[in-house]
């Protein structure tokens, strides 16, 4: 138990903690006053974003455009960066005042809308140190954290949470499913100084836990004892042959026998056809391979379990969560089918503020976005039905014309004339 716990025990201290929003842990005691907003981007100033975001200098990379897409909740508020060219790499980044998350919570949040019904493409962000050359950001550029949805074919529909730990990108051991519909979704990553994390989609928790448990940052705490090996006489057989069981004397019968009912055909010529042999049939008395009865093995010791020892290589690291320097947020993606819109970027140290910001942005426009999409779908259905009706009408008309063309020409006569004609002929 930490001495801090003793230090902070006393009347009304919980209230003080609440009022001052103090968070404390065994390793760190820190005050969290006003939320620090390190980066926020909502694209509300028209083309202003072009001066804040830097593109990689490469002609064959895809272009981002400012758009709210084909459907939206609010045309202005829902404007974001949209990928606009199919089968392209995209590289765009924005810098901010460098900061360290040591001793404090880190929250990364943004919205993604795959309105193109994405088949293969990234929807994730990367947080880089400020040492990144933004004009040369690429797939191998070293980042601190990569977070967000990724879809590619039927096999990949996941939320990546990757930390660069001691120079190596370490993937989460859990499978977090991302949203794969056409609507805007809010993705949030929370990393806390007690080495815990939380992933939220649409402001609801989808995963949480400890960094040490859910990533392979550190060697395992326990390893198999290298000096231990299964004893020679360790018997893992649960059942053995009954030594008292023996094969019955009449057991061995051939599998096939000559058909006793078969007769040599009368026209069989031994000189021409060779010696006649009756066809063989399955022997009804054949019993197959004899196997002795199985009994419980009196020497059975169970499955040998390799004993484990403390791993001498293991030592805990209370600062897995911490990075000295965050300075750039980047979109470094590949998209087969373009159309994804990124918006409402936020990097802060305050979970409550992030949730509030999510509710005030994504939360406010999501219902109207769905409404507009539903309306468009309904209109499309109606148009499709109208087109189908028109097509059917045209087909019927064409069929009638064809029938008229095909049938032999008859003189047009009134019914009365035709009937009279019939009588006369009769």
């Amino acid at each position: 138990s930490s001495s801090l716990e003793v230090l902070f025990q006393g009347p009304g201290l919980n209230d003080i903690f609440e009022a001052q929003k103090i968070e404390w842990h065994e390793e760190n005691l820190y005050f969290q006053g006003e939320p620090a907003v390190y980066f926020k981007e909502q694209f509300l100033d028209g083309d202003g974003w072009t001066s804040r975001w830097i593109e990689k200098h490469k002609s064959d990379f895809g272009k981002f455009v400012l758009s709210s897409g084909k459907f939206y909740g609010d045309e202005e508020k829902d404007k974001g960066l949209q990928t606009s060219q199919d089968a392209r790499f995209y590289a765009l980044s924005a810098s901010f005042e460098p900061f360290s998350n040591k001793g404090q919570t880190l929250v990364v949040q943004f919205t993604v809308k795959h309105e193109q019904n994405i088949d293969c493409g990234g929807g994730y962000v990367k947080l880089f140190p400020n040492s990144l050359d933004q004009t040369d950001m690429h797939g191998d550029s070293e980042y601190n954290i990569m977070f967000g949805p990724d879809i590619c074919g039927p096999g990949t529909k996941k939320v990546h949470v990757i930390f660069n730990y001691k120079g190596k990108n370490v993937l989460i051991n859990k499978d977090i499913r991302c949203k794969d519909d056409e609507f805007t979704h809010l993705y949030t990553l929370i990393v806390r100084p007690d080495n815990t994390y939380e992933v939220k989609i649409d402001n609801s928790q989808v995963e949480s836990g400890s960094l040490e448990d859910d990533w392979d940052f550190l060697p395992p705490k326990k390893i198999k004892d290298p000096d231990a090996s299964k004893p020679e006489d360790w018997d893992e057989r649960a059942k053995i042959d009954d030594p008292t069981d023996s094969k019955p004397e009449d057991w061995d019968k051939p599998e096939h026998i000559p058909d006793p009912d078969a007769k040599k055909p009368e026209d069989w010529d031994e000189e021409m056809d060779g010696e006649w042999e009756p066809p063989v049939i399955q022997n009804p008395e054949y019993k197959g391979e004899w196997k002795p009865r199985q009994i419980d093995n009196p020497d059975y010791k169970g499955t040998w379990i390799h004993p484990e020892i403390d791993n001498p290589e293991y030592s805990p690291d209370p600062s897995i969560y911490a990075y000295d320097n965050f300075g750039v947020l980047g979109l470094d993606l590949w998209q087969v089918k373009s159309g994804t819109i990124f918006d409402n970027f936020l990097i802060t140290n305050d979970e409550a503020y992030a949730e509030e910001f999510g509710n005030e942005t994504w939360g406010v426009t999501k219902a109207a976005e769905k409404q507009m999409k539903d309306k468009q779908d309904e209109e499309q259905r109606t148009r499709r039905m109208m087109r189908t009706k028109m097509r059917m009408r045209r087909m019927r008309r064409t069929r009638r014309k064809m029938r008229r063309k095909m049938s032999p020409a008859r003189p047009r006569t009134s019914c009365r004339e035709a009937c009279l004609q019939g009588w006369t002929e009769a």
Epitope: C152, G155, K158, N169
Partner: antibody, heavy 127, light 107 residues
Framework: EVQLVQSGAEVKKPGSSVKVSCKAS????????ISWVRQAPGQGLEWMGG????????NYAQKFQGRVTITADESTSTAYMELSSLRSEDTAVYYC????????????????????WGQGTTVTVSS | SYELTQPPSVSVAPGKTARITCGGN??????VHWYQQKPGQAPVLVIY???NRPSGIPERFSGSNSGNTATLTISRAQAGDEADYYC?????????FGGGTKLTVLG
């Protein structure tokens, strides 16, 4: 799991080109990435390049840039490797190898290693 | 360009532990894969991402990676483990293989 079957052995003249095919079965072709690796007699493995069919783009080892073309035909689930301006040093066994896509970036393919290999195609370059 | 260095050969007595190393500048920051290749056959992936075993690969095969050296460890070596072993990494959008190590199981 995907299986990879390569085309048969080839004997080529110096200066000519060779095109080796690698047909995938037993999996969704677009969910895999294909690499081409060669091995000269008595030598080690050498990566030539790779393609992710769903991307439609290939990337190549610097050594082979301009001389190798890797393509994929999704309709027949077949990847191809064409090597031009052949010389005697190109005599080798050429392997295609695949790994399942785990994401939309190039690095995902290589992050998990190449877990399925073709049987190899022997290409002999001799005058 | 990035280089991986492997010893040309390693010998081990049956039942003992063989260790094959793969050296590279700060290799510990990269993901290392190991392949086994028997004469006349295609390579087989035995370890991916430093220490993960694909299904069907015996537990006797393990891997580690830190600093400037990655290691493939084969415990309780058997005659059937005799093969060439290659390490591999991904660096600067390129796949790099080590030169290979011939493992001989004595006896």
């Amino acid at each position: 799991e995907v299986q990879l079957v390569q085309s048969g052995a080839e004997v080529k003249k110096p200066g000519s080109s060779v095109k080796v095919s690698c047909k995938a079965s037993g999996g969704t072709f677009s969910s895999y990435a294909i690499s081409w690796v060669r091995q000269a007699p008595g030598q080690g493995l050498e990566w030539m390049g790779g393609i992710i069919p769903i991307f439609g783009t290939a990337n190549y080892a610097q050594k082979f840039q301009g001389r190798v073309t890797i393509t994929a035909d999704e309709s027949t689930s077949t990847a191809y490797m064409e090597l031009s301006s052949l010389r005697s040093e190109d005599t080798a066994v050429y392997y295609c190898a695949s790994s399942p896509l785990r994401g939309s970036g190039w690095y995902w393919h290589y992050y998990y290693g190449m877990d399925v290999w073709g049987q190899g195609t022997t290409v002999t370059v001799s005058s | 360009s990035y280089e991986l260095t492997q010893p040309p050969s390693v010998s081990v007595a049956p039942g003992k532990t063989a260790r094959i190393t793969c050296g590279g500048n700060k290799i510990g920051t990269k993901s290392v894969h190991w392949y086994q290749q028997k004469p006349g056959q295609a390579p087989v992936l035995v370890i991916y991402r430093d220490s993960n075993r694909p299904s069907g690969i015996p537990e006797r095969f393990s891997g580690s990676n830190s600093g400037n050296t990655a290691t493939l460890t084969i415990s309780r070596a058997q005659a059937g483990d005799e093969a060439d072993y290659y390490c591999q990494v991904w660096d600067s959008s390129t796949v790099v293989f080590g030169g290979g190590t011939k493992l001989t199981v004595l006896g």
